[in-house]
Structures are given as C-alpha cells and as structure tokens.
C-alpha cells in the first residue's frame, strides 16, 4: 500500500509509545494475536492481525490508525500466509513489535 | 555532537539543599525525555527522575519522591534537579541521560554526561 | 515495584563469549537496553531495543529478550570488554526506569 506520511506515523508511534508506557495491567486481557513478519507484511497484515481482537479499548485508535494507512478493507486471516510458523502473542507483545519496527523505520530516514 | 553538561554538585550537610543543572547541546533538547541517574560509591546505577520533553510529564523513584524536583527550561536547553531534605544515602554521581529517541520515557539513554558528585555529610 | 535480577559476576576467557543474563516477571514484553560501565566512567549504551546496536559498538555485542530472561551477548570477548554491565527497563506499572544490580564482566588471563 502507499507508505503514509511521516505525520500520520509519528502519531502511530506515539499512540504505540502511550500504550506500552502506560500498560498498568495485561493489555487487552492478555489476548493473544498472529505473530507476524513485519518486514514482509506491513501496515494491513499488521491490522489484519489485530482485527481478531474485539472489545479492547486500549488498542481501539491504534486500530483506526492502522485503518487509515491500509488501502482496501482488511478481513480476519486475510493474510495468513505472513503468519509467523502459526505462533500466537499476546498483544502486548504485538504491540512493542510494531513499535520497534516502526522506531526503526524512522531510524533509517525511511518516513522523515 | 551531543554533549550533556552537570553541574552544581558539591558538599552539603544533612537536611540542606542543592541544585543540579544539566546544561545539554547538539540536538533538538525540547524533543526528548530526560532523565537523571545515580551511583553511591562502590554501587549500581539507581534511576532517580525522568521528564518528558515538555516537561508536562515527571516521574520520580520511590526514595526521591517529595524530596527531589525535576524540571526543564526548553528555551535554555536545561535540565535541572533540585534536590531537598538531603539525606547521607543521596551521596552519589549524579549523571543526566538523554531518551534514544522522541516520545516517551520507554528508551535507552543514548548519550550521558560525566557526573556531578554529590556528597551528604555532617 | 518491577525487580531485574542480573549475576553480580561472569567470568570468561579471552577469545570465548560471555552471556549475561537479566531475569525479569515477562521481561520478553518489555523493552531492554544494556550498558557498558568501566571504572570512573559513566556509562555507554551498548544495545538497545532488545537487540539493536548503537553506532559505534562493534558487532561482537548482540542482545535477546524473550520470556522472563534477557541476555547480552558479547562474542569473541577482548580484555578491553572487562567492565560492569546494566540491563534498564521501563516498568508502565510504576512509571520507573529499573536498571538490574550489574554484572561484573572479568576478562581471565
């Protein structure tokens, strides 16, 4: 998909930045999400892992965010095929991932 | 080139005060949290405070709290610690320590400066 | 609050690698950065992020973190690496940065 400006990220990786550093209990109930190769994958696969989760308020804009940055309506296991070897995370996890990566994306000049 | 400042430190008996100061060039100061890091002679690091690059967030270690206050000016591009009601186990290095990277407090402390002693005797 | 359990020492000869652990409740979901600390010198970033590298560290020093251990890697050990390690989080609980006890890291021979 088209890479989103480095406005929109920056704001992707603070509302990242405000889940992890905030995180008072187990995000999400500790639910678990596909494991996924970011590198390979992107902004859809990365939702399309997250839309198996419902009901967490926590990770709702994050969400919409990544919504924004995907070009056509992302369904549930649309991208299996970027799973990693089938492993489940907890979102927690998922989400310090994407936060990293992203962080690195940044890193590298490759959304300034 | 980044460089990290301290000074202010010195001698001070039981209950007195100091104040530190971190003066900090070579990067956008406003954009990255800060933080300030001690070590009592023969010891480990023990973190003390962290602000935001705002200065609208602080955060402070349990042994610190209500005692010592940190604070930024952006427009001088420094850091400060004012530290009261000093107690003999405050006697320490104290190093300032910049975020890695913009946003949050989550980040490694990329740069530090060399320390300002910080001795609490009677 | 959040404890990070680091071995006070680690011995390992010249030319080996050494590992150094830091034990922490479901360290694997938070984020860890080590240092390099040698005497009367304040400390040096050498991994952060878990596993990535500032500019500057040689590639001899790698980092992991998974589960409730992470580990700092340094691989063909020089007598120069002899120092005292940290491992430092950030505890959302808390809102505290922790750093671990240190590791001593002695260079035999």
């Known amino acids: 998909g088209p890479v989103p400006p480095s406005t929109a990220l920056r704001e992707l990786i603070e509302e990242l930045v405000n889940i992890t550093q905030n995180q008072k209990a187990p995000l999400c109930n500790g639910s678990m999400v596909w494991s996924i190769n970011l590198t390979a994958g992107g902004f859809c696969v990365a939702l399309d892992s997250l839309t198996n989760v419902s009901g967490c308020s926590a990770i709702e804009k994050t969400q919409r965010m990544l919504s924004g940055f995907c070009p056509h309506k992302v369904s549930a296991g649309q991208f299996s095929s970027l799973h990693v070897r089938d492993t489940k995370i907890e979102v927690a996890q998922f989400v310090k991932d994407l936060l990293l990566h992203l962080k690195k994306l940044f890193r590298e000049g490759q959304f300034n | 080139e980044v460089q990290l400042l301290e000074s202010g430190g010195g001698l001070v008996q039981p209950g007195g005060s100091l104040r530190l100061s971190c003066a900090a060039s070579?990067?956008?100061?406003?954009?990255?949290?800060m933080s300030w890091v001690r070590q009592a002679p023969g010891k480990g690091l023990e973190w003390v405070s962290a602000i935001s690059g705002s200065g609208g967030s602080t955060y402070y270690a349990d042994s610190v709290k209500g005692r010592f206050t940190i604070s930024r000016d952006n427009s001088k591009n420094t850091l400060y610690l004012q530290m009261n009601s000093l107690r003999a186990e405050d006697t320490a290095v104290y190093y300032c320590?910049?975020?890695?990277?913009?946003?949050?407090?989550?980040?490694?402390?990329?740069?530090w400066g060399q320390g300002t002693l910080v001795t609490v005797s009677s | 609050s959040y404890v990070l359990t680091q071995p006070p020492s680690v011995s390992v000869a010249p030319g080996q690698t050494a590992r150094i652990t830091c034990g922490g409740n479901?360290?694997?979901?938070?984020?860890v950065h080590w240092y390099q600390q040698k005497p009367g010198q304040a400390p040096v970033l050498v991994v952060y992020?878990?596993?990535d590298r500032p500019s500057g560290i040689p590639e001899r020093f790698s980092g992991s973190n998974s589960g409730n251990t992470a580990t700092l890697t340094i691989s063909r050990v020089e007598a120069g690496d002899e120092a005292d390690y940290y491992c430092q989080v950030w505890d959302s609980s808390s809102d505290h940065v922790v750093f671990g006890g240190g590791t001593k890291l002695t260079v035999l021979g």
């Open positions: 992020d878990d596993s």
């Open positions: 320590a910049k975020a890695d990277f913009w946003s949050g407090t989550l980040w490694g402390f990329d740069y």
């Open positions: 070579g990067f956008t100061f406003s954009s990255y949290a």
């Open positions: 479901n360290i694997g979901n938070k984020i």
